[in-house]
C-alpha cells in the first residue's frame, strides 16, 4: 500500500541496507524510491538532542513484511519508498539547501555571481553530482562567491554540516535542464577501454545504456553479447567512467557493443522501464517466490505487484501439466541485476514495470502508427481530449491534451464566451463523439487559467490550461503527452501529426471519429510570407502542404501537434488559427509550446 | 594558453559550400572537446557541431544534420567544418571553441576564435 506522509519522531528498528547522507527527509526518501531494495527509510534531522554525526543521516532499509518495528525518538523521521505508489516520481530536486555544506570530493573551484551560477555550472559539467556555493557573506574574504562542485561515487554527499553562508544543492541534470551532448547511439563492435566503476548482468546493450544512465557515477558503458567468445564475460554490463567525461579510446571488438549515458539529454526518456521480455533466457538471482502463471505476461504483472520483485523469469507448462499455468520465479539481487544470465533453457525472462513510473509517463510506448485526415484507431492518441461545454446543449467545444494527471493544455479562444469552468466537460479515452452519453464519466474543471497576455488567436499567447476537479488515472487510451523541452529548440520535427474531431472542409460539421492528419513544419519565414497581413512570431510555429489538402479545422481548436522524435511523442502545438481550412499556401497557425513551457510549469506547479 | 584562429568564412549563394577551419595552438591537450558556435545578428550564441578530440565522438544540433561536417586533423590540431547545401538562415559569425566538456553551453569552453562572418544569400 501507499503510504506518503512522513513520520515524525518515529525511527523504523532494523532492516538496515546502507546509510547515506541527504539534506531533507523528502530527499532521502527519494534516494529510497530509487535504490533497487529500499522500502523504507529513517533520516535524522538536526536536533539539540542528537549527535551532530548523525544529524542528516538517511538509513535505507527492507523489510520481507514491508514494514518495520516503530520506536518513538525525537528528531527521526521516518517514511516509506515511493515503490508502493503508482503516482509518478522524479528525482529531479531544485531545493537549495542553506547553511548546509554537503561534502564530497571537491574537483572544481571557481568563482560564481550566484548559487543559481553555481547550480547551473554544476548541471553543465559532467561529473558534478552537487555543489556548495560561499555567498558574499561569507566570513573568510578568499571564499566569498567560491562554487565548489562535488562528486561521489553514490551521488549522494558523504557528510552533511551545519556551515553559516554557504547554500548546497543538486545537480539539475535529472531535471533534463543540461547543455551537455548528448549521444544516444549505440556503437557496434566496439570496447571503450576506460575505468570501470561497477559491473552488472544485462540481457542487452539498451538495458545496460539504461543501467548507466541513472548509475551516479557512469558516463559510458561496454556490453559483451551473448555471443562474446569469453563466455565468462557474456552479457557483462560494464560502467565507465574517465577524467575529460568521454572514451579516451575505442578498439574495435566484435560482439561487444558500447554507449553512453543518457542522464545529460534534455528530452524524455524511458529509463528505469525495462518493457521487454528475453525469450530462451533464464535470469538468476535470489528467489522470492514461485507462483503459477497463464503467461510469461502474467508473470510480468505478478512481478510488479510484488513490490520487492525485480525481475522474473517463466517457464511455460509442459503440455497438459496444471491447466495449462507455467511457473513464475520471482527474484531480486541487492543491485536489482540478475547475478547471472542464462540462454537455451526455455525460460522467458524479463523485468518489474513498477519502475516504469518513475521514468515520465508520457515516455512510454504507445500503440504504433482534419481535412484530408484519416480515422484513427482507439489508444493511438492518448493525450487527446475532447471538451464539451453543457450550455446552452452539450457539444464538443475544442481539443485538449493530458499533460499531467490533473491539467489539460489548451487553446485560449475555446473560452470565449465561457462564464465559468462549471459548464465544461473533459472526456478522456475517447475515439467516437457517439460513444459519448448520458452516464459516460468526465473530468469537470476546477479552474480556467488563460495566458494573461492572450488577447485574440492571432496576436499569440493563445494557450489556455484546465485544471481538472479530479486526478486521471493513466491507462493505455488516455495518458498524457510530453511537453518539448526548451532544450530541444532546434530539433526539427518530421513526424507530426495534427488530431482532432473538427470540420473536414470548411462548411461541415463535427466529425464522429477522431481524425489524423501527417503534416510537416513549415518555417516561420515560409509561413510569415504566406500571412502578409499578420506577424507571425517565435512563439508560433507553422505547419501544413503548400498544395494545401490536409489541415486543423472547426473544432480541432486546442487540440495537438503531436511529433515523434527519439521514438517519444512531444506536444509541438496547440491548434490555433489559419485562413480558411487547408487551403493551397495556407499553413495552420499553431501555439509554439516550447516557448511557453515555463509558463506551464509555473502555472501547474504552484502550490 | 590556448589560441584559437579561425578562417574560411565569406559569402556564398543559397546551396553553395564553404569550409572553415579552426587552427590551435598552445596548451592544446587540455582541451576534450571542440566546438563551432555561431551568433545571427540579434540572436544567442548556439552550438552548431562538437567534436571531442581524442575519441573522435561527434554531435551536431538538428538544423544542420546532413549537411555540416565536423571533422579533425590531429597533426595540425586543426578542426574543420565542412558546410553544404548553405541556406539563409545559416548566415552568421562562426566561432570556433575548445574546452574540457563535450557540451552545447557556450560556458563550458575557456577558449574561443575571434570569429569569421559567413553570408548566404538567396
Known amino acids: 500500500e501507499c503510504v506518503t506522509q512522513l513520520l515524525k519522531d518515529t525511527c523504523f528498528e532494523g532492516g538496515d541496507i546502507t546509510t547515506v547522507f541527504t539534506p531533507s527527509a523528502k530527499y532521502c526518501q527519494v534516494v529510497c524510491t530509487y535504490h533497487p531494495r529500499c522500502l523504507l527509510f529513517t533520516f535524522t534531522a538536526e536536533s539539540p538532542s542528537e549527535d551532530p554525526t548523525r544529524w542528516f543521516t538517511c538509513v535505507l532499509k527492507d523489510s520481507v513484511t514491508e514494514t518495520l518495528p516503530r520506536v518513538n525518538r525525537t528528531a527521526a523521521i521516518s517514511g516509506y519508498s515511493f515503490k508502493q505508489c503508482s503516482h509518478q516520481i522524479s528525482a529531479c530536486n531544485k531545493d537549495i539547501y542553506v547553511d548546509l555544506d554537503m561534502k564530497g570530493i571537491n574537483y572544481n573551484s571557481s568563482v560564481a555571481k550566484s548559487a543559481q551560477e553555481c547550480q547551473e555550472r554544476c548541471t553543465d559539467d559532467v561529473h558534478c553530482h552537487f555543489f556548495t556555493y560561499a555567498t558574499r557573506q561569507f566570513p573568510s574574504l578568499e571564499h566569498r562567491n567560491i562554487c565548489l562542485l562535488k562528486h561521489t561515487q553514490t551521488g549522494t554527499p558523504t557528510r552533511i554540516t551545519k556551515l553559516d553562508k554557504v547554500v548546497s544543492g543538486f545537480s539539475l541534470k535529472s531535471c533534463a535542464l543540461s547543455n551537455l551532448a548528448c549521444i544516444r547511439d549505440i556503437f557496434p563492435n566496439t570496447v571503450f577501454a576506460d575505468s570501470n566503476i561497477d559491473s552488472v548482468m544485462a540481457p542487452d546493450a539498451f538495458v545496460c545504456g539504461r543501467i548507466c544512465t541513472h548509475h551516479p557515477g557512469c558516463l559510458f558503458f561496454t556490453f559483451f553479447s551473448q555471443e562474446w567468445p569469453k563466455e565468462s564475460q557474456r552479457n557483462l554490463c560494464l560502467l565507465k567512467t574517465s577524467e575529460s567525461g568521454l572514451p579516451s579510446t575505442r578498439i574495435k571488438k566484435s560482439k561487444a557493443l558500447s554507449g553512453f549515458s543518457l542522464q545529460s539529454c534534455r528530452h524524455s526518456i524511458p529509463v528505469f522501464c525495462h518493457s521487454s521480455f528475453y525469450h530462451d533466457t533464464d535470469f538468476l538471482g535470489e528467489e522470492l517466490d514461485i507462483v503459477a502463471a497463464k503467461s510469461h505476461e502474467a508473470c510480468q504483472k505478478l512481478c510488479t505487484n510484488a513490490v520487492r520483485c525485480q525481475f522474473f523469469t517463466y517457464t511455460p507448462a509442459q503440455a497438459s501439466c496444471n491447466e495449462g499455468k507455467g511457473k513464475c520465479y520471482l527474484k531480486l539481487s541487492s543491485n536489482g541485476s540478475p547475478t547471472k544470465i542464462l540462454h537455451g533453457r526455455g525460460g522467458i525472462s524479463g523485468y518489474t514495470l513498477r519502475l516504469c513510473k518513475m521514468d515520465n509517463e508520457c515516455t512510454t510506448k504507445i500503440k504504433p502508427r482534419i481535412v484530408g485526415g484519416t480515422a484513427s484507431v482507439r489508444g493511438e492518441w492518448p493525450w487527446q481530449v475532447t471538451l464539451h461545454t453543457t450550455s446552452p446543449t452539450q457539444r464538443h467545444l475544442c481539443g485538449g491534451s493530458i499533460i499531467g494527471n490533473q491539467w489539460i493544455l489548451t487553446a485560449a479562444h475555446c473560452f470565449y464566451g465561457v462564464e465559468s469552468p462549471k459548464i465544461l466537460r473533459v472526456y478522456s479515452g475517447i475515439l467516437n463523439q457517439s460513444e459519448i452519453k448520458e452516464d459516460t464519466s468526465f473530468f469537470g474543471v476546477q479552474e480556467i487559467i488563460i495566458h494573461d497576455q492572450y488577447k485574440m488567436a492571432e496576436s499569440g499567447y493563445d494557450i489556455a490550461l484546465l485544471k481538472l476537479e479530479t486526478t486521471v488515472n493513466y491507462t493505455d487510451s488516455q495518458r498524457p503527452i510530453c511537453l518539448p523541452s526548451k532544450g530541444d529548440r532546434n530539433v526539427i520535427y518530421t513526424d507530426c501529426w495534427v488530431t482532432g474531431w473538427g470540420y473536414r472542409k470548411l462548411r461541415d460539421k463535427i466529425q464522429n471519429t477522431l481524425q489524423k492528419a501527417k503534416i510537416p513544419l513549415v518555417t516561420n519565414e515560409e509561413c510569415q510570407k504566406r500571412y502578409r497581413g499578420h506577424k507571425i512570431t517565435h512563439k508560433m510555429i507553422c505547419a501544413g502542404y503548400r498544395e494545401g489538402g490536409k489541415d486543423a479545422c472547426k473544432g480541432d481548436s486546442g487540440g495537438p501537434l503531436s511529433c515523434k522524435h527519439n521514438e517519444v511523442w512531444h506536444l509541438v502545438g496547440i491548434t490555433s488559427w489559419g485562413e480558411g481550412c487547408a487551403q493551397r499556401e495556407r499553413p495552420g497557425v499553431y501555439t509554439n509550446v516550447v516557448e511557453y513551457v515555463d509558463w506551464i510549469l509555473e502555472k501547474t506547479q504552484a502550490v | 594558453q590556448v589560441q584559437l584562429v579561425e578562417s574560411g568564412g565569406g559569402s556564398v549563394q543559397a546551396g553553395g559550400s564553404l569550409r572553415l577551419s579552426c587552427a590551435a595552438s598552445g596548451y592544446t591537450y587540455s582541451m576534450g572537446a571542440m566546438a563551432w558556435f555561431r551568433q545571427a545578428p540579434g540572436k544567442e550564441r548556439e552550438g552548431v557541431a562538437l567534436?571531442?578530440?581524442?575519441?573522435?565522438?561527434?554531435s551536431y544540433t538538428d538544423s544542420v544534420k546532413g549537411r555540416f561536417t565536423i571533422s579533425q586533423d590531429n597533426s595540425k590540431n586543426t578542426v574543420y567544418l565542412q558546410m553544404n547545401s548553405l541556406r539563409a538562415e545559416d548566415t552568421a559569425v562562426y566561432y570556433c571553441?575548445?574546452?574540457?566538456?563535450?557540451?552545447?553551453?557556450?560556458?563550458?569552453?575557456?577558449?574561443w576564435g575571434q570569429g569569421t562572418l559567413v553570408t548566404v544569400s538567396s
Open positions: 571553441a575548445a574546452g574540457t566538456q563535450f557540451s552545447w553551453s557556450p560556458g563550458s569552453y575557456n577558449y
Open positions: 567534436i571531442a578530440t581524442s575519441s573522435g565522438f561527434i
